[in-house]
């Protein structure tokens, strides 16, 4: 058996491509967040429904996947997935005094529906999540407001009708919400006084003003000649988490990068041997990226069909047939500011002191890709395309 890694990276790419297809502007999501939420669904599904979802998170060696599995083997495989996701959540929450990473999962279930106690216990054990009763049958709109306000409370940011009026009705039985919030301290702070308003070019003709932060320091960096792009790794405090920015040389070079990108390439580009320490003159917009997606159609497009259909097998969640997740919302939120560890002698020196000419310029003033990776677990916390401030 393989681990969560390979399949999850492929899944990340499939998701990104699909989200990019349906969203003109920025694309931003948390693969880890989505994986844990899918884990919660796997926990409650059985048979073909579970198998379809498991494939997304888990790959196996060819021979094993081809033979028919006994129920015991299926259960073992499921438990392995939940155990790995539990360890992942524990791992990435370890150093949380250095950064705010909040992954919240919640299931909202029709209050008259009976759920298996084992599912209630295990979803808490593995995913620190709970089932919240709501009255979809008699008060669908009140339930909608209750769900909206919970999501709002998770990120302290006003959500304008996450679920718009009429989106939930009396036949809704189950809604799954996954929210991920991240704000970290850079390993080297960007001096606030160096932040200037600059143009961010959406394309060759159109620009929008942004607050552009600046720092000349030593970063993991490389040129990607074949892609006509640069990649830079920007560490957060303690180096447990890093943001990688993939910036095309040309204003409109992002499409070319996305066409050539693959899961293998991503792993290769960010491997320690591929990047080298270079002095980089980094210009990065101050960001507050926030996106919400109903993942049901997106997941269907990447091959998950049964989990959201009337015929889904949720017998691990309820004895009653006909239960399925009607909505699966994922909301991710990222704050990027200048804040970091105070610069000390020998570390990131301000631009005014250092000669900018000796630095590689990485000027993020046009659309770029970025992702945030957790080093220890080698997992991608966030993946995004920033194309419009």
């Amino acid at each position: 058996m393989d681990s969560l890694g390979t399949a999850a990276t492929q899944f990340l790419f499939d998701l990104f491509k699909e989200l990019n297809k349906t969203n003109d502007g920025n694309v931003f999501f948390s693969p880890v967040g989505i994986s844990t939420a899918i884990g919660m669904i796997i926990l409650g599904t059985r048979g073909a429904t579970a198998s379809e979802l498991q494939k997304v998170l888990y790959t196996e060696q060819g021979t094993e996947s081809s033979r028919i599995k006994s129920e015991e083997e299926e259960i073992e495989k499921r438990e392995e997935i939940h155990h790995q996701l539990q360890m992942l959540l524990t791992e990435i929450s370890k150093f949380s005094n250095d950064y705010d990473l909040i992954i919240s999962n919640r299931l909202f279930g029709e209050k008259t529906y009976l759920f298996l106690q084992k599912y209630i216990d295990y979803v808490e054990k593995y995913y620190h999540a709970s089932l919240e009763p709501v009255d979809f049958v008699n008060a669908a709109d009140e339930s909608r407001k209750k769900i909206n306000s919970w999501v709002e409370s998770q990120t302290n940011v006003k959500v304008k009708d996450l679920f718009p009026e009429g989106s939930l009705n009396s036949s809704t039985k189950l809604v799954l919400i996954n929210t991920v919030y991240f704000k970290g301290l850079w390993d080297r702070e960007f001096k606030k006084e160096h932040t200037k308003e600059e143009d961010f070019w959406l394309n060759k003709n159109l620009s929008k003003p942004v607050q552009m932060m600046a720092l000349c320091s030593s970063f993991n960096f490389t040129f990607l000649e074949d892609l006509q792009a640069k990649i830079v790794g920007i560490p957060y405090k303690n180096n447990d988490i890093s943001m990688f920015v993939l910036l095309p040389n040309d204003i409109d070079g992002l499409e070319k990068i996305m066409d050539k990108m693959s899961p293998e390439k991503l792993v290769e580009w960010t491997s320690p041997g591929h990047l080298e320490q270079r002095r980089v003159d980094l210009r990065l917009p101050r960001l507050q990226v926030e996106e919400t997606y109903d993942l049901e159609p997106v997941l269907e497009a990447v091959g998950i069909h049964s989990a959201f259909s009337e015929h889904a097998d949720y017998s691990g969640m309820s004895a009653r047939s006909g239960l399925h997740a009607q909505n699966f919302l994922h909301r991710s939120f990222l704050v990027v500011t200048e804040e970091g560890v105070e610069a000390t002698a020998g570390t990131g020196v301000g631009l005014k002191v250092s000669s900018a000419a000796s630095c590689e310029l990485v000027h993020c003033n046009h659309p770029f890709l970025f992702f945030i990776r957790h080093r220890e677990s080698d997992s991608i916390l966030f993946f995004g395309k920033f194309s419009s401030p």
Partner: antibody, heavy 129, light 112 residues
Framework: QVQLQESGGGVVQPGRSLRLSCAAS????????MHWVRQAPGKGLEWVAV????????YYADSVKGRFTISRDNSKNTLYLQMNSLRAEDTAVYYC??????????????????????WGQGTLVTVSS | DVVMTQSPLSLPVTPGEPASISCRSR???????????LGWYLQKPGQSPQLLIY???IRASGIPDRFSGSGSGTDFTLKISRVEAEDVGVYYC?????????FGQGTKLEIK
Amino acid sequence: QVQLQESGGGVVQPGRSLRLSCAASGFTFSSYGMHWVRQAPGKGLEWVAVISYDGSNKYYADSVKGRFTISRDNSKNTLYLQMNSLRAEDTAVYYCARDLGAVIAVAGTSTPYNWFDPWGQGTLVTVSS
Amino acid sequence: DVVMTQSPLSLPVTPGEPASISCRSRQSLLHSNGHNYLGWYLQKPGQSPQLLIYLASIRASGIPDRFSGSGSGTDFTLKISRVEAEDVGVYYCMQALQTPYTFGQGTKLEIK
């Protein structure tokens, strides 16, 4: 489909012991709470005991407390009722029943093990000298 | 223990006519979560009981909609809108608020 089959009933003298079994099939046994309910001949229903899905929680009717023990073997998909110090008033058809599920209350809390569905066909226990 | 009282104990009904069974509990079955912990079971002649209604008014899976449950607190009712021949048997109400769970004495529904 879901099936529950009780066995182990029979005629036994007062003060003696008997062990009932309930073989479950057609569902993931280890995910469900299970109950025993009895019915004296020509009389109404009396709930006897419940056990949680993992066997960690057990509750009994006062009339059997200290004499009867409910247990389960999830690897064998089997529920048991060990009946000791049997009395004439324990004479009844004993049914095993699957629990239907928990009502979710405020986040994370629930009231489990309240509803019985389906039931087995029952096994008759006669306590007589 | 919570005492449950049913009435009538015997109910002769003409097919196609409605039927109603009452169930009273000594103490309120209303949980702090807003649900009434009362269920209705039917035991057909020579068969095991089956669940009809839980939480006072929710029909169990596969139960026809001619069966309906109502009530709150201590007074509950099971109604059959149009009795059919297959509905004969003994109907039991049961409180599930606290262990030991207790049943009513049963109401025998028979066809006139």
